[in-house]
């Protein structure tokens, strides 16, 4: 911590500008007014302050706002956000999506840090649910965000938000997460026609029950093998050979390459050999 010393004559900062990069840490502490800093936070982002200087500026804000920064300051933190600890962020009340975007922008290109995770958690809890605009924003910055949530957290996602989800956002989701998201997606896309519906629901099908897969098999959807391999084993097992053939359409030939992998392996073992032979793929039950 920088010791308290009087500001030298003529060095009191009238504004936050580039001249401050030439101040020593103790001079910043002594000569920069915390209230001035708070009102001119937007300028800090354009000035090449060192790590050490940013520490001093953070310390000044901490002294001014011991209960947590107001959103007017948070929105303009810029690179100073990277200096915040999760404990600092837990004191904040962030309600504006613009503030969230501004801070996520600072961390862009990096993995989700504990600071960012805490910020998002505070923001979502403050809103009460993960609405479409928030989900849009979060998945734009972190495509894997949705799959980082627990099934319990996902349960607060309203079906209307599902429209913001892109296939790549679900790449790392496990079956438990898809179990929660699938019914929401089914509800969100229910008014779409067959082919459009399948395009939208496809990436959520890892959470689909048997009866929905049976229904899809009646719609000439031509599911690809990559999607089929992500289906729940317990949902695939009751499907008949005819239903799987209809579900996969021309992609049915791909079953041969996947015959040793779940869920194909388990499904094959449940079928009568005569039925498997009708596929002409040499599958052995």
């Amino acid at each position: 911590e920088v010791e308290k010393t009087a500001c030298p004559s003529g060095k009191k900062a009238p504004e936050i500008d580039e001249s401050l990069i030439f101040y020593k840490k103790w001079e910043l502490e002594a000569c920069v007014d915390a209230a001035l800093l708070a009102t001119q936070m937007d300028r800090v982002n354009a000035i090449p302050f060192t790590y050490e200087q940013l520490d001093v500026l953070k310390h000044k804000l901490d002294e001014l706002y011991p209960q947590g920064y107001p959103e007017s300051v948070i929105q303009h933190l810029g690179y100073l956000f990277l200096k915040m600890s999760p404990e600092d962020i837990r004191k904040w009340n962030v309600t504006s999506l613009e503030t969230l975007k501004a801070l996520l922008e600072v961390n862009k290109g990096h993995e989700m840090s504990p600071q960012v995770a805490t910020l998002i958690d505070r923001f979502v809890k403050g809103r009460g649910q993960l609405d479409k605009d928030t989900l849009d924003t979060l998945t734009a910055f972190y495509p894997g965000y949705l799959c980082s949530l627990s099934p319990e957290e996902l349960s607060s996602v309203p079906p209307s938000s599902i429209w913001a989800v892109r296939p790549q956002d679900l790449d790392t989701c496990d079956p438990r997460q898809l179990d929660v998201l699938y019914p929401k997606a089914r509800l969100a896309f229910q008014n779409m026609n067959g082919s459009e519906y399948f395009v939208k629901i496809q990436s959520f099908l890892g959470g689909a029950p048997t009866e929905d897969l049976k229904a899809l098999s009646q719609q000439n959807v031509s599911m690809d093998l990559a999607t089929f391999m992500k289906l729940r084993t317990d949902a695939v097992l009751p499907l008949t050979v005819a239903e799987v053939q209809k579900l996969l359409g021309p992609h049915v030939e791909g079953l041969k390459a996947e015959e040793r992998h779940r869920p194909v392996r388990d499904w094959i073992l449940r079928q009568r050999q005569d039925d498997l032979d009708t596929l002409g793929l040499g599958l052995q039950g």
């Epitope: 060095k11 580039e18 020593k24 302050f49 690179y79």
Partner: antibody, heavy 119, light 106 residues
Framework: EFQLQQSGPELVKPGASVKISCKAS????????MNWVKQSNGKSLEWIGI????????SYNQKFKGRATLTVDQSSSTAYVQLNSLTSEDSAVYYC????????????WGQGTSVTVSS | QIVLTQSPAIMSASPGEKVTMTCSAS?????MHWYQQKSGTSPKRWIY???KLASGVPARFSGSGSGTSYSLTISSMEAEDAATYYC?????????FGAGTKLELK
């Protein structure tokens, strides 16, 4: 050991541009600001500007603003200065110099890059 | 910008002699830094924050001053000290250098 290795000498025509590199090694590149300094044939030194390699933020000497551009490539720990619309006045040796902790002057300097502007 | 005036511009000293060179600022500065440069090489940080010696600098060197008046002193000149010494202020934007004092061996 700390080292700032600069690119080789440049002979350029008036009106052209030049880009000089400075590769840092032996320390964490993003932890210290990088300065650029001009020295015209054996004369004194002129500060061009400074860049924070972590955020890419810059500050320039007003005299060089608009004609000098400072950039960094974090992946290769390299700082650059690009000088545009060169005239004979720009013939000089250009140095990169690391900013010392807590503004304790410029603690490590590159070996310098000679730029000659001549038609 | 702050102008730094170094004097003398050129000086010579015999081995063992005490040497003092000065740097005068057009406005008050918090600290002064000094660099040593030998012909054909890059400058080296020599004295920083007015009076702190950089790593490897012999103890015969010292720096002092405040406000607008600063100086570099060598208590006993040695041959290896022959070089040009530049003062530099880092207190005001932009940082500026003096024109240098060239110290020669007599």
């Amino acid at each position: 050991e700390f080292q700032l290795q600069q690119s080789g000498p440049e002979l350029v025509k008036p009106g052209a541009s030049v880009k000089i590199s400075c590769k840092a090694s032996g320390y964490s590149f993003t932890d210290y600001n990088m300065n650029w300094v001009k020295q015209s044939n054996g004369k004194s030194l002129e500060w061009i500007g400074i860049i924070n390699p972590n955020y890419g933020t810059t500050s320039y000497n007003q005299k060089f603003k608009g004609r000098a551009t400072l950039t960094v490539d974090q992946s290769s720990s390299t700082a650059y200065v690009q000088l545009n619309s060169l005239t004979s006045e720009d013939s000089a040796v250009y140095y990169c110099a690391r900013g010392g902790y807590d503004n304790e002057a410029m603690d490590y300097w590159g070996q310098g890059t000679s730029v000659t502007v001549s038609s | 910008q702050i102008v730094l005036t170094q004097s003398p511009a050129i000086m010579s000293a015999s081995p063992g002699e005490k040497v003092t060179m000065t740097c005068s600022a057009s406005s008050s500065v918090s600290y002064m830094h000094w660099y040593q440069q030998k012909s054909g090489t890059s400058p080296k940080r020599w004295i920083y924050d007015t009076s702190k010696l950089a790593s490897g600098v012999p103890a015969r060197f010292s720096g002092s001053g405040s406000g607008t008046s600063y100086s570099l002193t060598i208590s006993s000149m040695e041959a290896e000290d022959a070089a040009t010494y530049y003062c530099q202020q880092w207190s005001s934007n932009p940082p500026t250098f003096g024109a240098g004092t060239k110290l020669e061996l007599k």
